[in-house]
Interface confidence: low
């Protein structure tokens, strides 16, 4: 048993451009608090898996009001450590999630409103009893600086908090065969209760005579590292001659998962999938309740209605999973009609509608041509929500009010001269060229390049572009 301790040093804008706006304002003062979730192992766990090592919520920080015009500074923090007690052995490797929450202190009825400002996660190796480890994590434009450590609760000692220590029975020495408990030199190792030979570093026991292995170790005495090699069989104790693993018991043999948990082998060890109400490396810890803080992202925790469901998390909009840890992509349901752009704002969905459409889900088709007249014989065309006029020849512009100069774009190639005509434009080609736009050179022998000149027109004649 022991305690994981987290000390938040600062939370504020990270380096670089794009500093975030202060989360608080004079109109809406706020304060911060933090939440930490710990899971054993370095393996990528399912996002909704519970905080099997434990979770903790900080106190609220001091009330902060933004100074108008000032950039967001490091925000005032809650006092004290976040402490996550662990009842089992410290696993040595762990995953963490740290959430920074904002509590708005407006005048809304019914208490403050909470919103998640930032969420960082990582996987680390850490020996219990070691010094504070410092860390910096960034979430968007925010930066979180913190330190953490794991310490054993007496009488446990060691890197996994699995060795037990007791005060010396005599001032001068420990009992026969028992060593002093470094660094607690005034204490002695407790009498051996685990199976004889059980590795003090990699094994632990909760009952006399047993030897249970920490993640990454196997064998009856937890002395065999679980490794992958080029050998055919990835199991069993190491062969002294080849250095390879020879066939032997698999990590799931005998099912190390208690309380109906199911075991699956991983490259380094095994993993237990626990039934609801149990957690821990081997599903050995029971009774997850709302007091353990299993619901994330503002999920509402309520005690289950029967013994098989110790708690139920009811998730806020945008989150799902048994612990509200999985973000829902509500836009994947394509709620916006008529090509509208879906925006998931977390607290709500918004649809940004294309021109010509309106409504919360862009469901209303506006009549683009209603009340719109196209001048000079043009006709109104609805398309893609945008009003457009199809203009009669010789007219252009949005409403066909502009007289079109067909020659304005200089359509005649190779020095051809352009003449406006009631039905369009006519190009008078320079010598040596022909075609509607004077685009085809005339060969010296009088033959034209493809396509041929239409019958009845000599090369060099004005070409009418219809």
């Amino acid at each position: 048993a022991g305690v994981f301790e987290l000390q938040i040093h600062s939370f504020g804008p990270g380096p670089g451009p794009g500093a975030p706006r202060s989360p608080c304002s004079a109109r809406l003062p706020c304060r911060l608090f933090f939440r930490v979730c710990l899971k054993p192992g370095l393996s990528e766990e399912a996002a909704e898996s519970p905080c099997a090592l434990g979770a903790a919520l900080s106190a609220r920080g001091p009330v902060y009001t933004e100074q108008p015009g000032a950039p967001a500074p490091d925000l005032p923090l809650p006092d004290g450590l976040l402490q996550v007690p662990f009842r089992d052995a410290w696993p040595g490797t762990f995953s963490f999630i740290i959430e920074t929450w904002r509590e708005e202190l407006g005048d809304q009825i019914g208490g403050p409103a909470w919103s998640l400002l930032a969420r960082v996660a990582g996987r680390r190796r850490l020996a219990a009893g070691g010094p504070w480890a410092r860390d910096i994590q960034r979430a968007g434009a925010w930066e979180l600086r913190f330190s953490y450590r794991a310490r054993c609760e007496p009488p446990a000692v060691g890197t996994a908090c699995t060795r037990l220590c007791r005060p010396r029975s005599a001032p001068s020495r420990c009992g026969p065969g028992l060593r002093p408990c470094a660094p607690l030199e005034d204490e002695c190792e407790a009498p051996l209760v685990c199976r004889a030979g059980c590795s003090p570093e990699h094994g632990f026991c909760e009952q006399p005579g047993e030897c249970r292995c920490l993640e990454g170790w196997t064998g009856p005495l937890c002395t065999v590292p679980v490794s992958t090699s080029s050998c055919l069989s990835p199991r069993g104790p190491s062969s002294a001659t080849t250095g390879c693993l020879v066939p032997g018991p698999g990590p799931c043999d005998g099912n190390p998962c208690a309380n109906g948990g199911s075991c699956s082998e991983t490259p380094r060890s095994f993993e237990c999938t626990c039934p609801r109400g149990f957690y821990g490396l081997r599903c050995e810890v029971s009774g997850v309740t709302c007091a353990d803080g299993p619901c994330f992202n503002g999920g509402l925790c309520v005690g289950g209605a029967d013994p098989d469901s110790a708690y139920i998390c009811h998730c806020p909009p945008g989150f799902q999973g048994s612990n509200c840890e999985k973000r829902v992509d509500r836009c994947s349901l394509q709620p916006c009609r008529n090509g509208g752009l879906c925006l998931d704002l977390g607290h709500a969905l918004r649809c940004r509608c294309r021109a010509g459409f309106a409504g919360p889900r862009c469901e209303h088709d506006l009549d683009d041509c209603a009340g719109r007249a196209c001048a000079n014989g043009g006709t109104c065309v609805e398309g893609g929500g945008a009003h457009r006029c199809s203009c009669a020849l010789g007219f252009g512009g949005r409403d066909c009010r502009e007289r079109a100069d067909p020659c304005a774009a200089r359509p005649c190639a190779h020095g051809g001269r352009c003449y406006a005509h009631f039905s369009g434009l006519v190009c008078a080609c320079a010598p040596g060229y022909m075609g509607a736009r004077c685009e085809f050179p005339v060969h010296p022998d009088g033959a034209s390049a493809l396509p041929a000149a239409p019958p009845g027109l000599r090369p060099g004649d004005p070409q009418r572009y219809l």
Epitope: G110, G298, L300, V302, G303, A348
Partner: antibody, heavy 118, light 107 residues
Framework: QVQLQESGPGLVKPSETLSLTCTVS????????WSWIRQPPGKGLEWIAY???????NYNPSLKSRVTISLDTSKNQFSLKLSSVTAADTAVYYC????????????WGQGTMVTVSS | EIVMTQSPATLSVSPGERATLSCRAS??????LAWYQQKPGQAPRLLIY???TRATGIPARFSGSGSGTEFTLTISSLQSEDFAVYYC?????????FGGGTKVEIK
């Protein structure tokens, strides 16, 4: 500040179905859990049911067989239907919003009195 | 279901005095408890949630304490507007249940 307004008939005959609607004054109906609570004259409060925009519902087991709760996000409304009513269902019916971090009720409608009588 | 029992049913207190209201759960509800105030002809108003956290806008004279099965609402110095009926409510288990109420009246 969001406001809730109950509406529906004040008098229902025995064995008929009581139907009430609660209108939410803003567009927050997709962001919260919504509930119905009732209070018989001179008595205490009884939770009836709640609904969430995703369709998740929960009912008081004592009323579950007779209650239906539904929600219409396009109209910012949620509704209650209580079938086979008797005189014991005479009460002030409140709609309320569930608080974000716990199933307490932070915003209430003013209540509507429903009398079951022939 | 969890039965919430409030005592006393009626509490007679003079303005300026301290009022202590009790709420007991038939089984542990952790800290998942709320307190409400209801005046005649009005809807209840949330005072306390999480057993001890005051809702926004609630005066500091209202305080809540307790966890598990025993809870207390204390009004340190009763004002004229505090005379009302007070209800506790648990939200630890289904169904959500309320206490029978304590009426605080002028002595």
């Amino acid at each position: 500040q969001v406001q809730l307004q109950e509406s529906g008939p004040g008098l229902v005959k025995p064995s008929e179905t009581l139907s009430l609607t609660c209108t939410v004054s803003d567009n927050s109906i997709s962001n919260y859990y919504w509930s119905w609570i009732r209070q018989p004259p001179g008595k205490g409060l009884e939770w009836i049911a709640y609904i969430y925009y995703s369709g998740t519902t929960n009912y008081n087991p004592s009323l579950k067989s007779r209650v239906t709760i539904s929600l219409d996000t396009s109209k910012n409304q949620f509704s209650l239907k209580l079938s086979s009513v008797t005189a014991a269902d005479t009460a002030v019916y409140y709609c309320a919003r569930l608080f974000n971090w716990g199933f307490a009720f932070d915003i209430w409608g003013q209540g509507t009195m429903v009398t079951v009588s022939s | 279901e969890i039965v919430m029992t409030q005592s006393p049913a009626t509490l007679s207190v003079s303005p300026g005095e301290r009022a202590t209201l009790s709420c007991r759960a038939s089984q542990s509800v952790s800290s998942n408890l709320a307190w409400y105030q209801q005046k005649p002809g009005q809807a209840p108003r949330l005072l306390i949630y999480g057993a001890s956290t005051r809702a926004t806008g609630i005066p500091a004279r209202f305080s809540g304490s307790g966890s598990g099965t025993e809870f207390t609402l204390t009004i340190s110095s009763l004002q004229s507007e505090d005379f009302a009926v007070y209800y506790c409510q648990q939200y630890n288990n289904w169904p959500l249940t309320f206490g029978g109420g304590t009426k605080v009246e002028i002595k």
